[in-house]
């Protein structure tokens, strides 16, 4: 009982120190452009609410450095997102947590069900292309009342 | 990526290797440490998250060497105690995105000497 | 643990050449490998990740390929600064990351 309290006050101090930002904005940007390849209403980067020019007062510490040389947009956020979700590695329970947080912030976005669908598909996919271990169990459904939390 | 606080020690030592990184948003980046012994291959050691909360040893080094971190003064360390001959070796910090796996950016290694 | 192994250990090729260097992993390692080449006295370069994107700044004569357990580096047209030693390199969740003992690549 009392590791358990520990555990989950450390993994609270994880996920309020961690920005898991640029995780939402790389699955927003993949299901946004998977849905152009379908033929849909092409996602204007003028248009993401996501923009730093949205936020000027704060210097995004996503924008590139002079060691990032692997292209800019998507694929950039997908690694600031796996350097989030690396702290949490050792940690499944909080993994999942991570990931739900990110499932609710992003719910009011997704429009419609398929949406919702594809998103927390490329969720659960998140940590292995991060060459980081999924938690096995994570209910995902920001509807649920009572959660399971792992 | 540089690295400093190489030198020679006798067996059972301690050394406090440091990389210290320019022009990177270094708390984003899991750092490494990866040796080399003389005319041998490379041996990846010791990995570091971002913020250090998961760090991993390879079993030739774990109990004996100690990573860590000070993202304020951009600095990963390497504490090396209880040294024997075959920790002799160039030691190299590098940097790994997570996306590839790969390390991308190395220092040019310090050198560690352990000898009686 | 996964142990990777090289061959061969040792090269010899004139400028010119087609050459290729084979990397096996004892389990496999998804698309976690990239190859590295590594001069003397200096520290090794990233070549090639995820088995065959060449990392920026890498001349378009390496190339790399394979999938599972086997991989193998090309160079398509030796060059006299290709003379060199080069490591292959994996991940893996577990045991996270190793090195094969590397292929120098010498002037015949």
């Known amino acids: 009982q009392q590791w358990e309290l520990q555990g989950d006050r450390r993994c609270q101090s994880q996920l309020e120190r961690a920005n898991l930002r640029p995780c939402e904005q790389h699955l927003m940007q993949k299901i946004q452009r998977d849905e152009d390849s379908y033929g849909r209403d092409p996602y204007s980067p003028s248009q993401d609410p996501y923009s730093p020019s949205q936020d000027p007062d704060r210097r995004d510490p996503y924008s590139p450095s002079p060691y990032d040389r692997r292209g800019a947009g998507s694929s950039q956020h997908q690694e600031r997102c796996c350097n989030e979700l690396n702290e949490f590695e050792n940690n499944q329970r909080c993994m999942c947590e991570a990931l739900q947080q990110i499932m609710e912030n992003q719910s009011d976005r997704l429009q419609g069900r398929q949406q919702e669908q594809q998103f927390k598909r490329e969720l659960r996919n998140l940590p292995q292309q991060c060459g980081l271990r999924a938690p096995q169990r994570c209910d995902l459904e920001v509807e649920s009342g009572g959660r399971d939390r792992y | 990526l540089v690295e400093s606080g190489g030198g020679s020690v006798p067996p059972g030592g301690s050394l406090r290797l440091s990389c210290v990184a320019s022009?990177?948003?270094?708390?984003?980046?899991?750092m490494n440490w990866v040796r080399q012994a003389p005319g041998k291959g490379l041996e990846w050691i010791s990995s570091?998250?971002?913020?250090?909360?998961?760090?991993y040893y390879a079993e030739s080094v774990r109990g004996r060497f100690t990573t860590s971190r000070d993202n304020s003064q951009n600095t990963v360390f390497l504490d090396l105690t209880d040294l024997t001959v075959e920790d002799t070796a160039l030691y190299f910090c590098?940097?790994?995105?997570?996306?590839?796996?790969?390390?991308?950016?190395w220092g040019q290694g310090t050198a560690v000497t352990v000898s009686a | 643990d996964i142990v990777m192994t090289q061959s061969p250990s040792t090269l010899s090729a004139s400028v010119g050449d087609r050459v290729t260097i084979t990397c096996r992993a004892s389990?496999?390692?998804?698309?976690?490998l990239a190859w590295y080449q590594q001069k003397p006295g200096k520290a090794p370069r990233l070549l090639i990740y995820?088995?065959?994107t060449l990392e920026s700044g890498v001349p378009s004569r390496f190339s790399g390929s394979g999938s599972g357990t086997e991989f193998t580096l090309t160079i398509s047209s030796l060059q006299p600064d290709d003379f060199a030693t080069y490591y292959c390199?994996?991940?893996?969740?577990?045991?996270?990351?190793?090195f094969g003992p590397g292929t120098k690549v010498e002037i015949k």
């Open positions: 590098a940097k790994t995105p997570l996306l590839t796996r790969a390390f991308d950016v």
């Open positions: 022009g990177v948003y270094f708390s984003d980046w899991a």
């Open positions: 570091i998250s971002g913020r250090g909360a998961n760090i």
């Open positions: 389990q496999s390692v998804n698309t976690w």
């Open positions: 995820k088995v065959s």
């Open positions: 390199q994996q991940y893996n969740i577990d045991s996270r990351y190793s």
